[in-house]
Amino acid sequence: CKAMHVAQPAVVLASSRGIASFVCEYASPGKATEVRVTVLRQADSQVTEVCAATYMMGNELTFLDDSICTGTSSGNQVNLTIQGLRAMDTGLYICKVELMYPPPYYLGIGNGTQIYVIDPEPCPDSDF
């Protein structure tokens, strides 16, 4: 297992609709064709997996059907979007990137993006 640098923004504020987007960028040492991206949430010293996707370079990220995450890739950047967030989901969201193929296997873990979420009042006749 070889180390790899992963960069992500320090802070992101979720929208009033509970949507947060951030970029996860990795310094690929070689020409990876298969990449796995995992979003982890750290809160109260507990780490849980929020979502994960494996993709072939140049293709769309495919998350599980019931995932709260969506994403697109462009070169060594992954644009991640998490939806349905509420105040209790505030926490540090860590981007983990694995270069699965071809060998050698590389692993990179970002420092995390602190996502802040508020629970806004619903506006009349609209979805916020």
Epitope: R17, G18, R41, T48, E49, V50, D65, D66, I68, I82, Q83, G84, L85, R86, A87, M88, D89, G91, D119, P120, E121, P122, D127, F128
Partner: antibody, heavy 123, light 107 residues
């Protein structure tokens, strides 16, 4: 095991207020939102509002704004729903239901409900 | 306000039939939708969450699909105990509106 136990049935006069309680046990009270939903006799489900037991903040459906207050007591793991200015159309069964933050991957929203509290408004 | 419209409002089917209930939402809610079954005199029971995830303990004959504004609950083989009213609900954000319900009866 997870339990949401609500207070007993109430009979109120028009114009009065009612306060229904929902006592939670079997999980970390402050880690889950709590909703209030009501159901009038022979009618569908109607969402009333949500309270965050961690911070105590609440959000109410527009229909109940100014008439409903949702609070919580963390020392007893209990949430309360108070509805004022009662009218006959408020006659319904009132339910509480818990709801985890979405990033609690193993959690499903509205997975546990209280047994319901019948509130009858009659002169 | 955000509207959830279920169809049909009532239906009658035979034991063993495949039954489909639809829920249309007036705004895009991605996949954040629940389905419930409520038997007469009982509390609502969660069947499906996030549009397609089967709640623990729910029989596999129940399935959900859809995304955005159009969602479907399917019962692959109707059983006598499925006599109930079924509700969809958006869990995207407040207000957590319910559909008006679909009353299912056995022929």
């Amino acid at each position: 095991q997870v339990q949401l136990v609500q207070s007993g049935a109430e009979v109120k006069k028009p114009g009065a207020s009612v306060k229904v309680s929902c006592k939670a046990s079997g999980y970390t009270f402050t880690s889950y939102y709590m909703h209030w939903v009501r159901q009038a006799p022979g009618q569908g489900l109607e969402w009333m509002g949500i309270v965050n037991p961690s911070g105590g903040t609440s959000i109410y459906a527009q229909k109940f704004q100014g008439r409903v207050t949702m609070t919580r007591d963390t020392s007893t793991s209990t949430v309360y729903m108070e509805l004022s200015g009662l009218i006959s159309e408020d006659t319904a069964v009132y339910y509480c239901a818990r709801d985890p933050p979405i990033t609690l991957v193993r959690g499903a929203p509205f997975d546990y409900w209280g047994q319901g509290t019948l509130v009858t408004v009659s002169s | 306000d955000i509207q959830l419209t279920q169809s049909p409002s009532s239906l009658s089917a035979s034991v063993g039939d495949r039954v489909t209930i639809t829920c249309r939402v007036s705004q895009d809610i991605s996949r954040l939708l629940n389905w419930y079954r409520q038997k007469p005199g009982e509390i609502p029971k969660l069947l499906i969450y996030r549009a397609s995830s089967l709640q623990s303990g729910v029989p596999s004959r129940f399935s959900g699909s859809g995304s955005g504004t159009d969602f479907t609950l399917t019962i692959s083989s109707l059983q006598p105990e499925d006599i109930a009213t079924y509700y969809c609900q958006r869990t995207y954000s407040a207000p957590y509106t319910f559909g008006q319900g679909t009353k299912l009866e056995i022929k």
